[in-house]
Amino acid sequence: FSPLRRISIKILVHSLFSMLIMCTILTNCIFMTMNNPPDWTKNVEYTFTGIYTFESLVKILARGFCVGEFTFLRDPWNWLDFVVIVFAYLTEFVNLGNVSALRTFRVLRALKTISVIPGLKTIVGALIQSVKKLSDVMILTVFCLSVFALIGLQLFMGNLKHKCFRNSLENNETLESIMNTLESEEDFRKYFYYLEGSKDALLCGFSTDSGQCPEGYTCVKIGRNPDYGYTSFDTFSWAFLALFRLMTQDYWENLYQQTLRAAGKTYMIFFVVVIFLGSFYLINLILAVVAMAYEEQNQ
């Protein structure tokens, strides 16, 4: 080994070197949180870039750049260091017009903390491993969601457009003429039934066990879907989103109540199956895979 390489190896394995890098990263993170940094922080920025460059040079001299098994670029953690340095010099010395997008990459410096703190390295390693192992579970999840989304599409397509419409219209008004002139929320409230505090017209259905309209109103299928049109089973993609919402239990009881009111109470069976299979089984299967991957990484 050349004297330069020997010195580089000594520096690299020294605990103070790791401490210096860790302190630099943490200080850099503090400086990045500043809203309106003063002018002198520019020089501090250069210092940080210099320290990161020095760290990478030490690693390259000690391990080699890319030829050989244990060289600098063969370690994925060093890719992050390399990218951080490249972007630091790019944003500083190359005129790229609007560099605000490139400046975003400075945030990657915070990720350098992972490669320095051993515990974090283990957790992130487990996370990456679990993502690899999750591929099969993800395929199963997407398949199950797709199947139920197709069932939902067949059962509830258009149902969430059912609304309670006012029966006592003016003599020359028709449903179509009203829908053509409706503009504001106030207009809608004039012709459709709204429960107090609700932002959507009352849903209803045409089966005996579905929601019925109050006196003076009749159930029609018109207008948009609830929640600004985002809640529906009208297309496969919307149905898939609704199923994903059920699986993650994201305010799922509202979707459940809306659908049951529009389609009928019988369809609770669909929701029971989806919640048991999607929410209880698949979510826990995903968690089990992550736990297994973490256990393996620890060993």
Epitope: T174, L175, F206, T218, V220, K221
Partner: nanobody
Framework: EVQLVESGGGVVQPGGSLRLSCAAS????????MRWYRQAPGKQREFVAR???????GYADSVKGRFTISRDNAKNTVYLQMNSLRPEDTALYYC??????????????????WGQGTLVTVSS
């Protein structure tokens, strides 16, 4: 497809009576309001009477007390009982309904439907 068919029109003497009926057919799920209109030759169409699905009724001032609107939900039919007919009641009587029906491969549609009309002539 939803169809409204009027029947019961004809020639009647002043002071006489007629009963018009309007039957809706198709894969009907719900009928909201049903209304009768009339159009005399050379005049604009005017509203006669209406009935909602909970049987609330309304009439034009010119027919109040003489005409009675009713409906049979089981048969999807609306009736207009016309008593004490006058020559100015001569017109083509149309029925209109707000219908929600299952159309085109099972999808549900709500809309306003009209009949072809039935002619009522009051003449001595």
């Amino acid at each position: 497809e939803v169809q409204l068919v009027e029947s019961g029109g004809g020639v009647v003497q002043p002071g006489g009576s007629l009963r018009l009926s309007c039957a809706a057919s198709g894969r009907i799920l719900r009928i909201g309001y049903m209304r009768w209109y009339r159009q005399a030759p050379g005049k604009q169409r005017e509203f006669v009477a209406r009935i909602t699905d909970d049987s609330a009724t309304g009439y034009a001032d010119s027919v109040k007390g003489r005409f009675t609107i009713s409906r049979d939900n089981a048969k999807n039919t609306v009736y207009l009982q016309m008593n004490s007919l006058r020559p100015e009641d001569t017109a083509l009587y149309y029925c209109e309904a707000l219908v929600t029906a299952s159309v085109r491969g099972g999808s549900i549609h709500s809309g306003t439907y009209w009949g072809q009309g039935t002619l009522v002539t009051v003449s001595s």
